[in-house]
Amino acid sequence: PPRGRILGGREAEAHARPYMASVQLNGAHLCGGVLVAEQWVLSAAHCLEDAADGKVQVLLGAHSLSQPEPSKRLYDVLRAVPHPDSQPDTIDHDLLLLQLSEKATLGPAVRPLPWQRVDRDVAPGTLCDVAGWGIVNHAGRRPDSLQHVLLPVLDRATCNRRTHHDGAITERLMCAESNRRDSCKGDSGGPLVCGGVLEGVVTSGSRVCGNRKKPGIYTRVASYAAWIDSVLA
């Protein structure tokens, strides 16, 4: 099933997030992703766990998954590079870089997003945008068009409370509020954007969605700048 869900959000303005990617398996949306360079999309490592023999592709320039749009184009994947320390049973190091078969054709609806290189936490209370094509309610309705939600960043101490994520949130992870509005495992790999800068990637660990005591977990890209640079080089 698609790993994707924006709960309690609303439809995004069409093509206002030109960095947004749909990672697809056998022609169906699987995960979110974010264009970070002309030929590279950043996503979550767990997204490809079940991909095995399937065909992985990346859709760029899309708002609707099904409708024809002039900016839409599906790219084959030349190389998939999961973070070397990612493991199936943990949310740590949940990053994946996908090299497209060719450089993306850039334009108003397809453009890489600057990503944070300064390794410091986003200040709690900052409102950040998360977007995706995942299911939009607990009944499992899947949207055709891109959804988004603006969520406040939560401080790590709160997120690590015993009643919340009980110490699982390392310095390489960050949290955002999940009170009825949330990202969920289906939006894995999608971007958390704060003030026009990519700060986090939705992790794909399984957790309850929309419960304020189980905040959304995001991998901090700044903490992986050296790895990202080394792969893109």
């Epitope: 200040a123 709690p124 900052t126 009825r180 509005r181 026009g196």
Partner: antibody, heavy 122, light 107 residues
Amino acid sequence: QVQLQQSGPELVKPGASVKISCKASGYTFTDYYINWVKQRPGQGLEWIGWIFPGSGSTYYNEKFKGKATLTVDKSSSTAYMLLSSLPSEDSAVYFCARYGYYGSSFYAMDYWGQGTSVTVSS
Amino acid sequence: DIQMTQSPASLSVSVGETVTITCRASENIYSNLAWYQQKQGKSPQLLVYAATNLADGVPSRFSGSGSGTQYSLKINSLQSEDFGSYYCQHFWGSPPTFGGGTKLEIK
């Protein structure tokens, strides 16, 4: 068109509480954060906190925790701010303001209420 | 908390002149900055968002610029309706503090 209509001026005694309102119209109330801002006479602007009407989530300036309580009534598209244990220095104009969204992740206070004057005096 | 230092605190200028108001953040705010105009006895009005973008209906004589910690609002060819107070506000973290304001007066 978008409008935020605030309740009228209040004269309250020191130590008392006051609840002021901000009625929204012209947009989907539950989709936008509502902020509250304080302005003392002849002074600058001070952010108190926000509430997201869709979920009731709140976030406060540390300085106003315990002083201000933000709530909403979705059925009437109205946001409220309760100010408690008022000393004279809480005499000010209080504004509500909506966060508008721009692009993917920028925001700013795009619509403001006309302000509610609160005077604390015995 | 991030501090926003706005200067000058007041400015006396004539109609037709050009003025620049500056705002310095105590740390990088990544262009997460807005400018507002407030007339006496009225509520503030949004002029600029994301440091450089004019809000709907704002005349083109207004312009915002800057990045990192340094930002400015420029008003070309001042009109009589431009007099009042101006405030910057950051949105990088909480609380989203305002600058102290700049009072623009007619000379």
